[in-house]
Amino acid sequence: GSTVPPMVNVTRSEASEGNITVTCRASGFYPWNITLSWRQDGVSLSHDTQQWGDVLPDGNGTYQTWVATRICQGEEQRFTCYMEHSGNHSTHPVPSGNSHHHHHHHH
């Protein structure tokens, strides 16, 4: 099939006092092989500080996955989610506390 770019969505949730979990979700993409990872100040976080979901079919012939990490509240602006898929790439910021979702569809 032809390439379908992912929709990338970054969310935040309270983890514990002073910490938040930021989750980057990619959905609706084809083929399955996608790079999704967190960066701090533009530098990759180690694997052991990130949690990944499996790449799973979403029932529409495309795929979905996610990556999450825990960060200190107030440092959100230092973190970005990086995506590579089928020769394209993009970075996605953590939304500020008063907004909840950032959606980006990439072509």
């Epitope: 092989n33 996608i34 790079t35 999704l36 694997h47 089928s86």
Partner: antibody
Framework: QVQLKESGPGLVAPSQSLSITCTVS????????VNWVRQPPGKGLEWLGM???????DYNSALKSRLSISKDNSRSQVFLKMNSLQTDDTARYYC??????????????WGAGTTVTVSS | DIQMTQTTSSLSASLGDRVTISCSAS??????LNWYQQKPHGTVKLLIY???SLPSGVPSRFSGSGSGTDYSLTISNLEPEDIASYYC?????????FGGGTKVEIK
């Protein structure tokens, strides 16, 4: 068919800088990372750093002050520059494509390597 | 940095033998481990990724296992073309680090 090929100077004088080019084919540098790894004679492998599809770089902190990795997507080339070479930088230098899919991160295709000798 | 130790630097085995190569990490690396084969002339090839996954084109006589800090690569039926050095590599933490290698020779 994915291929990577390193080209370097062969011989570098101590305190001078090293420049190596990795020319790739069969994939786009815009969408996958390339790593640099070296191997001193008779020793093991050492990861130097990498460049991602968007041009961001990660370096081995032990060498970060001397290293620079860049690329030219249109020419399908990745460049390694290392400053202030000493004799213990004598090694075979490899570039390798990085595959980073969730929990999996590996170097799936390697170049043949180029030998660099630091000597006066 | 995480230290990777391959205690056996070289071993001799007969064709058809089952060969096991061990690798230990200085801390838990959560299965974030790959194995590479380096032929005597220097060519490097990915053999196993994420502890036990086999890339396409790698013969099924190669297998990997382990968890925590201890991992192994097994060649179930040694062939002449398996004469090479084998390196483990962790990617749990940056920088990725390699073991010192195990050279496999024919008796």
């Amino acid at each position: 068919q994915v291929q990577l090929k390193e080209s370097g100077p062969g011989l570098v004088a101590p305190s001078q800088s090293l420049s190596i080019t990795c020319t790739v084919s069969g994939f786009s540098l815009n969408g996958q990372g390339v790593n640099w790894v070296r191997q001193p004679p008779g020793k093991g492998l050492e990861w130097l750093g990498m460049i991602w599809g968007d041009g961001s770089t990660d370096y081995n902190s032990a060498l970060k002050s001397r290293l620079s990795i860049s690329k030219d997507n249109s020419r399908s080339q990745v460049f390694l520059k290392m400053n202030s070479l000493q004799t213990d930088d004598t090694a075979r230098y490899y570039c390798a494509r990085g595959a980073h899919y969730g929990k999996r991160w590996y170097f799936d295709v390697w170049g043949a390597g180029t030998t660099v000798t630091v000597s006066s | 940095d995480i230290q990777m130790t391959q205690t056996t630097s070289s071993l001799s085995a007969s064709l058809g033998d089952r060969v096991t190569i061990s690798c230990s990490a200085s801390q838990n690396i959560n299965n974030y481990l790959n194995w590479y084969q380096q032929k005597p002339h220097g060519t490097v090839k990915l053999l196993i990724y994420y502890t036990s996954s086999l890339p396409s084109g790698v013969p099924s006589r190669f297998s990997g296992s382990g968890s925590g800090t201890d991992y192994s690569l097994t060649i179930s039926n040694l062939e002449p073309e398996d004469i090479a050095s084998y390196y483990c590599q962790q990617y749990s933490k940056l920088p990725p680090t390699f073991g010192g290698g195990t050279k496999v020779e024919i008796k």
